[in-house]
């Protein structure tokens, strides 16, 4: 069943019984909800696996990363698709299953003595390579989090946000990526025309923090398409 | 002890607002999707809304849409429930509940309450017409 391909967790503290089947361990909402997502898909299924969109690895699970189902298929349309297994081929780190990373168009193991010098090697050899991606860019990476013993302050070499501390997100600079701080009010974001097209910046900013969206700046209502600034402000 | 508390719960009249809080005690969930389910009295918990482990992703139920959002401060492990122009259909006992970052995700994941592990003991938000 669905639910024994996702979660292999117990049901912990569950809310007291308030009438119906609600209350029984395990017991799902009977008929699913439709639930909308970015792009106005709608799928109201349970018993079904639908694939998950997505626009960067982080959205997907731990053993998904994020990119086009097809190669060579249209960057705009991504799932998450299940991470590859060692000694398959790769094109970056988050293809990899965790306790792996790609090297050399490889998934191989994460040697924890290896590792560290191993992984900035890497990260530059992607990017300096025309095939190093699915869909022709670069995007958020993955690898186990046992890696990281604490959590990475700002300016920390990062893979993803988890790495880094509270208020803190994982983003690009240059060809590695570090802990930059998250968004405040009134802060300059990035708005991304397309989905995934985040990846093709050198110099990635954070997102928004909580309650804050990446909204237009009013007074810039006007401007050309090319040079309107986008801030973030209050929902 | 992991807890979840729920807070802001009330009556209200129809057409108005109230916001939900939910604390969560004992551990981070920074690597949860953290959701918001209801129950009316005889009716089954449904699902209301969702936001995942990544910031950016929610996710609403169809009754809920456009009228409720909901936000995450994981430096302050607080989640909300922000409902607006409420109706007396949205009376219910409102439960925060927490379910980890699987291995695979699909649509279904977060509207599927059996995928969450940790659930608050509820806030009851009445709407009066």
């Known amino acids: 069943t669905l639910n024994s391909v996702l979660n292999s967790n117990a049901i912990k503290n569950l809310p007291p019984p308030l009438g119906g089947a609600a209350g029984h361990p395990g017991s799902a909402v009977s008929a699913a909800p439709g639930i909308l997502y970015p792009g106005g898909n709608k799928y109201q299924t349970i018993d079904n696996y639908q694939p998950y969109p997505c626009a960067e690895d982080e959205e997907c699970g731990t053993d998904e990363y994020c990119a086009s189902p097809t190669r060579g298929g249209d960057a705009g349309v991504q799932i998450c698709l299940a991470c590859r297994k060692r000694r398959k081929r790769c094109m970056r780190h988050a293809m990899c299953c965790p306790g792996n990373y790609c090297k050399n168009g490889i998934c191989v193991s994460s040697d924890q003595n290896h590792f560290r010098g191993e992984i900035e090697e890497t990260i530059t050899e992607s990017f300096g390579n025309d095939h190093s991606t699915l869909d022709g860019y670069s995007r958020r990476t993955t690898l186990s989090s046992k890696m990281y013993h604490t959590k990475g302050q700002e300016g920390s070499v990062c893979l993803r946000s988890s790495d880094c501390a509270s208020g803190l997100c994982c983003a690009r600079h240059f060809w590695s990526k570090i802990c930059k701080p998250v968004l405040k009010e009134g802060q300059v974001c990035t708005k991304h025309r397309r989905k995934g097209s985040h990846g093709l910046e050198i110099f990635q900013r954070c997102y928004c923090g909580e309650g804050l969206s990446c909204r237009i700046q009013k007074d810039h209502h006007q401007a050309s398409n090319s040079s309107r600034l986008h801030t973030c402000q209050r929902h | 002890e992991v807890q979840l508390v729920e807070s802001g719960g009330g009556l209200v009249q129809a057409g108005g607002s109230l916001r939900l809080s939910c604390t969560a005690s004992?551990?981070?969930?920074?690597?949860?999707?953290m959701g918001w389910f209801r129950q009316a009295p005889g009716k089954e918990r449904e699902f209301v809304a969702a936001?995942?482990?990544?910031?950016?992703?929610?996710h609403y139920a169809d009754s809920v849409s456009g009228r409720f959002t909901t936000s995450r401060d994981n430096a302050k492990n607080t989640v909300l429930l922000q409902m607006s122009s409420l109706k007396p259909e949205d009376t219910a006992v409102y439960y925060c509940?927490?379910?980890?970052?699987?291995?695979?995700?699909?649509?279904?994941?977060?509207?599927?309450?059996?995928?969450?592990?940790?659930w608050g003991q509820g806030t009851q938000v009445t709407v009066s017409s």
């Open positions: 509940a927490a379910a980890p970052r699987p291995k695979r995700v699909s649509v279904s994941y977060f509207s599927t309450s059996s995928n969450y592990d940790y």
């Open positions: 936001i995942s482990w990544s910031l950016s992703r929610t």
């Open positions: 004992g551990r981070t969930f920074d690597n949860h999707a």
